[in-house]
């Protein structure tokens, strides 16, 4: 059919129409991390499961070595939740003792690395003081937003203290992105 | 017109292109819940408003009996916020009294039920220890991520204690999903 | 080319297919706010950066005077995070002194204004009691959901106390929307 032969070029000429199902997408889930020593201003990157359970990558969105690799330029929605858990932070006692009033905290940062740019870019940050009394504590930090990314950009999730990340369940700590 | 007759098959032959406006979508809002007995490891499902106010379902995404029914296979973004409110949890006193150091908590789980699969799958979990001092408390837990779902899958939102859910406003507690 | 002349009407006649890249989208980031007097039931709107750094508006989605202006009807995903920070709220002391047991709180509301409708509509609310002990505190509230909006609708983000908003970094406090 003449019409059938014409269709593909018709599609290309007039608009970058595309099937939604072939857009780059990924949902990564937590795995056990190396419990590293916690240093104040050094935020280690999490590593992730990319194919087992609920995790997947598709349509050229690849995961390698803690990074999601962006395969084509466009606007992406990027999200992550990290569930933290820890022992009681006795900051009330610290305060009473007259020491500096800087609370303990938990922080998640979604970072973009562009090879042609020397510095990583912090896209999203969730940071929370932790001043719990009387118990072990646990809580999530959720982040999500839309960003214009370039082909070759790399995304990672950094945390303030890797040893506090709850790695036990794939539904508690996760990281994803999809082309809009 | 001959062209009009041809168009649908033209669309099918080359790519599963589709109008964005006809994709399954739903945003459900909170309603008053039936107060149920709170059991430790049994998380009841919330029921929802699906057509009044801000709530809607469209394009074959249906809500019935606490479930969102997925009408076609694909990648969906699923989200929920539950606002909890409660009386003070005196876990600091509990601790001082030497009882077990297990904090009170609030939890939201977005669960997928597949009829052909015996066990529900937990897609997303937000869980937070609650150890407030000196006051009534209230706080939201937000969740959102992308999942590959199959036609016929059912989604629900479960919570650790239905009596703590703030059902007073449609903007405080909600549940939604849309095909990407 | 005859084919080229025909293409647009062919597209309109059969389905509202469109290039994803030309959909209205915006991601706004925090800027320093004008400190306003804090009134209990009056929630001031934040203003935003719309073109520097990570911020952008595109495809007729415009930002003006604290509002995102919706350029076409459809279903939008709308999101915001506001990071708050403050001094210790001694609500435990307040309680001990026998004064009313109403905790301090932080609240974010995403509001829709429709010129033809007298009252703004609250689309999303995140509200949290703040009863910290022993330290300065900081924490984010994240919101996101899908809504059916009409051309000409305006969106804004309101907060319970503008002086508590962390305006220091574009990744901590932000506001966005995109047509699905």
């Amino acid at each position: 059919l003449k019409g059938q032969e014409f269709a593909p070029s018709h599609q290309q000429v007039y608009a970058p129409l595309r099937a939604d199902g072939d857009k780059p997408r990924a949902h990564l889930t937590v795995v056990r991390q190396t419990p590293t020593q916690h240093f104040k201003n050094q935020f280690p990157a999490l590593h992730w499961e990319h194919e087992l359970g609920l995790a997947f990558t598709k349509n050229r969105m690849n995961y390698t070595n803690k990074f999601l690799l962006i395969p084509e330029s466009g606007d992406y929605f990027i999200y992550s939740q990290v569930t933290f858990r820890g022992m009681t932070s006795e900051c009330s006692e610290i305060r009473q003792a007259g020491r500096p009033n800087k609370p303990d905290s938990i922080t998640v940062v979604i970072t973009k690395v562009t090879d042609s740019y020397p510095e990583p870019t912090q896209l999203l940050m969730g940071t929370k003081s932790v001043c719990e009394v009387g118990s072990n504590w646990f809580q999530p930090i959720y982040l999500g937003a839309m960003f214009s990314l370039q082909e070759g950009d790399k995304l990672m999730v950094n945390v303030s203290d890797i040893s506090l990340v709850d790695y036990t369940k794939e539904d508690k700590t996760f990281f994803g992105a999809f082309l809009l | 017109l001959k062209g009009q007759e041809f168009a649908p098959s033209h669309q099918q032959v080359y790519a599963p292109l589709r109008a964005d406006g006809d994709k399954p979508r739903a945003h459900l809002t909170v309603v008053r819940q039936t107060p149920t007995q709170h059991f430790k490891n049994q998380f009841p499902a919330l029921h929802w408003e699906h057509e009044l106010g801000l709530a809607f379902t469209k394009n074959r995404m249906n809500y019935t009996n606490k479930f969102l029914l997925i009408p076609e296979s694909g990648d969906y973004f699923i989200y929920s916020q539950v606002t909890f409110r409660g009386m003070t949890s005196e876990c600091s006193e509990i601790r001082q009294a030497g009882r077990p150091n297990k904090p009170d908590s609030i939890t939201v789980v977005i669960t997928k039920v597949t009829d052909s699969y015996p066990e529900p799958t937990q897609l997303l979990m937000g869980t937070k220890s609650v150890c407030e001092v000196g006051s009534n408390w209230f706080q939201p837990i937000y969740l959102g991520a992308m999942f590959s779902l199959q036609e016929g899958d059912k989604l629900m939102v479960n919570v650790s204690d239905i009596s703590l859910v703030d059902y007073t406003k449609e903007d405080k507690t909600f549940f939604g999903a849309f095909l990407l | 080319l005859k084919g080229q002349e025909f293409a647009p009407s062919h597209q309109q006649v059969y389905a509202p297919l469109r290039a994803d890249g030309d959909k209205p989208r915006a991601h706004l980031t925090v800027v320093r706010q004008t400190p306003t007097q804090h009134f209990k039931n009056q929630f001031p709107a934040l203003h935003w950066e719309h073109e520097l750094g990570l911020a952008f508006t595109k495809n007729r989605m415009n930002y003006t005077n604290k509002f995102l202006l919706i350029p076409e009807s459809g279903d939008y995903f709308i999101y915001s995070q506001v990071t708050f920070r403050g001094m210790t709220s001694e609500c435990s002391e307040i309680r001990q002194a026998g004064r009313p047991n109403k905790p301090d709180s932080i609240t974010v509301v995403i509001t829709k204004v429709t010129d033809s409708y007298p009252e703004p509509t609250q689309l999303l609310m995140g509200t949290k009691s703040v009863c910290e002990v022993g330290s300065n505190w900081f924490q984010p509230i994240y919101l996101g959901a899908m809504f059916s909006l009409q051309e000409g609708d305006k969106l804004m983000v309101n907060v319970s106390d503008i002086s508590l908003v962390d305006y220091t970094k574009e990744d901590k406090t932000f506001f966005g929307a995109f047509l699905l």
């Epitope: 795995v31 056990r32 419990p35 020593q37 916690h38 499961e49 087992l52 359970g53 022992m87 | - | -």
Partner: antibody, heavy 123, light 106 residues
Amino acid sequence: QVQLQQWGAGLLKPSETLSLTCAVYGGSFSGYYWSWIRQPPGKGLEWIGEITHSGITNYNPSLESRVTMSVDTSKNQFSLKLSSVTAADTAVYYCARGQVGTTDYYYFYMDVWGKGTLVTVSS
Amino acid sequence: DIQMTQSPSSLSASVGDRVTITCRASQSIRRYLNWYQQKPGKAPKLLIYAASSLQSGVPSRFSGSGSGTDFTLTISSLQPEDFASYFCQQSYRTITFGQGTKLEIK
């Protein structure tokens, strides 16, 4: 050469609390997961749980309500408490070091084990 | 929890034989699988990690293979010191072990 030395009471009555300690010699205490595993007589291995140097724990859900683990980083020691024991808790209890490694992906294994402590629960 | 099923539960063989023990996971675990050897009255000893990597100091007659749900431990030529029990263990989620395979002298 890392070695794990463990000790604790070997004979308990039902409803008592089992208490074991494991000391780490000749190696780093941080950067690893410190596990407890048990093996009833003539049976297979059951993982009880683990703890990190910072005191973060992860327990087997089937035992979680009765288990408490703790660390003493000043002594490079970690401990297990199992409350309300019954005859079904009779087993050899092992401590072990777990570590995360990497090739093209991540994995986890327990490469150093204590000699084991037989704990018998009997009235 | 992920269930690990080993087969056979016991096996008789002779010195010099080639022996294969299999382990099946109840869901895909990619290569999150380890093999341990345990002799009577002793603690388990790590042989293979990540399904096929040989632990330092373990003789090369031991090898592991498999991915997803099906895994194999192979001893290419049995030596007298190899008669023991063998356990597989998954480390993808909450750690679980197989029920064990007892390798005895024929």
